[in-house]
């Protein structure tokens, strides 16, 4: 004869567990069904009534079959530096994450507690490694040949124009000026300039570069103090 | 937390070499620049170069090009200045600060080495 | 080089006090303008560093603000822990600090 499918609630036999979506009552010292997502024990069942579940309130939420007297409260809303990517439901929590420009510095299980600015590389630094979710931007020094003259999360250091004949020769946060109407070529396309090993050495005197962007020998002028960067912006 | 520890006060005779340290801890080293700056008895601070761990790339002020050379060892978390051809007047207290490339500049700082140079 | 002329590079003042220190820069330094207390042996301390950005746990009454090439710090009323001497420090282009204003009580 085939088993008999026991309902709710009943006794286990000896050694055995409850099914699946099912718990042991210790008091009743019977399986009893748990109630779903969205819903909590409103009543807990005894020897002859099973669980009986009630909706979960407003701001509040189960997300597995459960047995709990009580719904979770949902997170707090999201702060001015987060958003919500999860809404609040009967079933879910909420789920807030950084908003575009922030990385999180403090995660929670699900979400971020801590939200932080990307860092910013100022003039005469570009991003090394760009932020993720979960990490921040680090900014490393242009290499000799390169520059940035922008505060930003996002900007790499980018390489001196070339000229026919330097005007003013590039620093690492100002690009060379030309005294001919324009350059004669600048990267070669496709080339990423991120900060990257040089010799050590001050960064005031500006290396013969490699051959593949050899400029005329006027551009190798030892680099003296030169005004800002016109273009550069504050924070 | 942010620590920099740097090495113990030393005196020198003129014409010698000194070499700080500065060790490093409670963040990723190789993310920030290491500086160095000095300050003579009650006078002000001056800038004397920086040094990024990660590459070894460095800028030095003017002044110090010729004698100063700017180290890092990543294995141990630690920058180094060597200042050579002492003289009596770079008699001074020797810092060292991070610097995250931001415009937050110089957020932590060693405790000072004192550099005493004297016939 | 950019050079940072800071005055006065002495104040006497009372507890309570409003207290100004300025910075002239030679050049345009933007907004990269840093300020810097340091107290007798102990090693400097950022207070304010892109002209108007109050680092973490540095008290309200410590304020930055500018005016073309000439920067201020403010302390809006001086307490007795705020005696001592004040740097700023330009790097915007290559670093440079100003002399110094050193604070006493009155």
């Known amino acids: 004869l085939p088993a008999q499918v026991a309902f709710t609630p009943y006794a286990p036999e000896p050694g055995s567990t409850c099914r699946l979506r099912e718990y042991y009552d210790q008091t009743a010292q019977m399986c009893c069904s748990k109630c779903s997502p969205g819903q909590h024990a409103k009543v807990f069942c005894t020897k002859t009534s099973d669980t009986v579940c009630d909706s979960c309130e407003d701001s509040t939420y189960t997300q597995l079959w459960n047995w709990v007297p009580e719904c979770l409260s949902c997170g707090s809303r999201c702060s001015s530096d987060q958003v919500e990517t999860q809404a609040c439901t009967r079933e879910q929590n909420r789920i807030c994450t950084c908003r575009p420009g922030w990385y999180c510095a403090l995660s929670k299980q699900e979400g971020c507690r801590l939200c932080a600015p990307l860092r910013k590389c100022r003039p005469g630094f570009g991003v090394a490694r760009p932020g993720t979710e979960t990490s921040d931007v680090v900014c490393k020094p242009c290499a000799p040949g390169t520059f940035s003259n922008t505060t930003s999360s996002t900007d790499i250091c980018r390489p001196h124009q070339i000229c026919n004949v330097v005007a003013i020769p590039g620093n690492a946060s100002m690009d060379a000026v030309c005294t001919s109407t324009s350059p004669t070529r600048s990267m070669a396309p496709g080339a990423v300039h991120l900060p990257q090993p040089v010799s050590t050495r001050s960064q005031h005197t500006q290396p013969t570069p490699e051959p593949s962007t050899a400029p005329s020998t006027s551009f190798l002028l030892p680099m003296g103090p030169s005004p800002p960067a016109e273009g550069s912006t504050g924070d | 937390q942010v620590q920099l520890v740097q090495s113990g006060a030393e005196v020198k005779k003129p014409g010698a070499s000194v070499k700080v340290s500065c060790k490093a801890s409670?963040?990723?080293?190789?993310?920030?620049?290491i500086h160095w700056v000095r300050q003579a008895p009650g006078q002000g601070l001056e800038w004397m170069g920086w040094?990024?761990?990660?590459?070894?790339?460095?800028d030095y002020a003017d002044k110090f090009k010729k004698r100063v050379t700017m180290t890092a060892d990543t294995s141990i978390s630690t920058a180094f200045m060597e200042l050579s051809r002492l003289r009596s007047d770079d008699t001074a207290v020797y810092y060292c600060?991070?610097?995250?490339?931001?415009?937050?500049?110089?957020?932590?700082w060693g405790q000072g080495t004192l550099v005493t140079v004297s016939s | 080089d950019i050079q940072m002329t800071q005055s006065p590079s002495s104040l006497s003042a009372s507890v309570g006090d409003r207290v100004t220190i300025t910075c002239q820069g030679s050049?345009?330094?933007?907004?990269?303008l840093a300020w810097f207390q340091q107290k007798p042996g102990k090693a400097p301390k950022l207070l304010i560093y892109?002209?108007?950005s109050l680092q973490t746990g540095v008290p309200s009454r410590f304020s930055g603000s500018r005016s073309g090439t000439d920067f201020t710090l403010t302390i809006s009323s001086l307490q007795p822990e705020d005696f001592a001497t004040y740097f700023c420090?330009?790097?915007?282009?290559?670093?440079?600090f100003g002399g110094g204003t050193k604070l006493e009580l009155k």
């Open positions: 600060a991070r610097d995250d490339a931001s415009p937050l500049v110089m957020d932590a």
């Open positions: 409670g963040y990723t080293f190789t993310d920030y620049i």
């Open positions: 040094i990024d761990p990660d590459y070894g790339n460095t």
């Open positions: 050049q345009n330094i933007d907004n990269y």
């Open positions: 892109s002209t108007y």
């Open positions: 420090f330009q790097y915007n282009n290559g670093y440079m």
